[in-house]
Amino acid sequence: MAVTACQGLGFVVSLIGIAGIIAATCMDQWSTQDLYNNPVTAVFNYQGLWRSCVRESSGFTECRGYFTLLGLPAMLQAVRALMIVGIVLGAIGLLVSIFALKCIRIGSMEDSAKANMTLTSGIMFIVSGLCAIAGVSVFANMLVTNFWMSTANMYTGMGGMVQTVQTRYTFGAALFVGWVAGGLTLIGGVMMCIACRGLAPEETNYKAVSYHASGHSVAYKPGGFKASTGFGSNTKNKKIYDGGARTEDEVQSYPSKHDYV
């Protein structure tokens, strides 16, 4: 039961995380105009990965896409790439994890296959989360660098007569969404990996083979050398955690690690 819960929770957390990564990637507020020196600005600038926007006091908002690829900073391109890779990996991870869910039955898929799929999706979620966190962090670092550079030459002009205020940008809402979403995807991935350990069979198990001795019959189960394997205590080989609801004859053939905890 705990495996299913861990896997299910991991899936849900990752799903929320990936939705957040997609939202962050699409958001326009990656960087917003710093209002420290002018809190009552009549023109407010903010920028995303794909376009920059200007919101006026009048309520008029104008957004312009970055219609060039080559003219964009390499760092911005890198952030875009990281976020897209994160989304793609996350989406594939979600697809894989749907089929890996213990509560979903697909044909006669064995636990080992589900375990492998769970591990694969978990790793994908971890990498996806890391990509998002890395992308957002690279952008944040870029902002910090530019912020202090623009602060250094905040006012430029002819003999101090004419002032040209350079627009400084600070962290936008998308950065926080991205960090949280990346973290959630990462946590979801870790949960999937933990769930995988519970799903994976210890070793290759074979059907119980009976050896008939002269006096009385003894059931011998190879490979069950752990003290906690339940040797001799569960001769019907029923699942312990679900109160013996399924027998060996049913779909679930292989006992998993978690069954004996």
Epitope: Q33, V43, Q166, T167
Partner: antibody
């Protein structure tokens, strides 16, 4: 047709109060930022106050801050300017204006005259 | 506060003549986000409220004759009337729309010879 009609002006003593109103029609009032602009007897234009679309943000120049309050009643399509602690330098023609792109004021009312004198 | 300086304070012209008036701001009105200059030009005829002519320094308001042209960037702006008509006789004001407080120039009065 867009129409802005100001009212409430008049003669008031220094230190007195006055509330100006601006009835808007011919456009979706809730979708526009509105402002008050005054014109002194010397014909100088001075921005007095701005209220953003939702009414959550208001802006004033230092000369009127703390004395004037801009507000709007979206249900009545009306803009207000509550003026208190009036000074002789507040004597002017007060115009109600609508802001559009570029923060430009595309429509102005005919104005209401305010005279602060003892 | 951004100081707006208009020159000349008055202009005496003849009908059909080309007229240029200038407006200087103490601070740049160019917004880096959209590369637009937040300067507006208004025309005020006697006994009337001001009328919007040009916004974003060079964008003509709908219904404004094309003889009115706004130009300039940063801190220096001009309003040009290619061929002055009798109905153009008015006071022209420039305004900073970039940052609060919004400030107006003292105006340029256009008079007929």
């Amino acid at each position: 047709d867009v129409k802005l009609v100001e009212s409430g002006g008049g003669l008031v003593k220094p230190g007195g109060s006055l509330k100006l109103s601006c009835a808007a029609s011919g456009f979706t009032f809730t979708s526009y930022t509105m402002s008050w602009v005054r014109q002194t007897p010397e014909k100088r234009l001075e921005w007095v106050a701005t209220i953003i679309i939702g009414g959550s943000y208001t802006y004033y120049p230092d000369s009127v801050k703390g004395r004037f309050t801009i507000s709007r009643d979206n249900a009545k399509n009306t803009l207000y300017l509550q003026m208190s602690s009036l000074k002789s330098e507040d004597t002017a023609m007060y115009y109600c204006t609508r802001l559009v792109k570029g923060n430009a004021m595309d429509y102005w009312g005919q104005g209401t005259s305010v005279t602060v004198s003892s | 506060d951004i100081l707006m300086t208009q020159s000349p304070s008055s202009l005496t012209v003849t009908a059909g003549e080309k007229v240029t008036m200038t407006c200087k701001s103490s601070q740049s009105l160019l917004n880096s986000g959209n590369q637009k200059n937040y300067l507006t030009w208004y025309q005020q005829k006697p006994g009337q409220p001001p009328k919007l002519l040009i916004y974003w320094a060079s964008s003509r308001e709908s219904g404004v004759p094309d003889r009115f042209t706004g130009s300039g960037s940063g801190t220096d702006f001009t309003l040009t009337i290619s061929s002055v008509q009798a109905e153009d006789l008015a006071v022209y004001y420039c305004q900073n729309d970039y940052s609060y407080p919004f400030t107006f120039g003292a105006g340029t009065k256009l008079e007929l010879k």
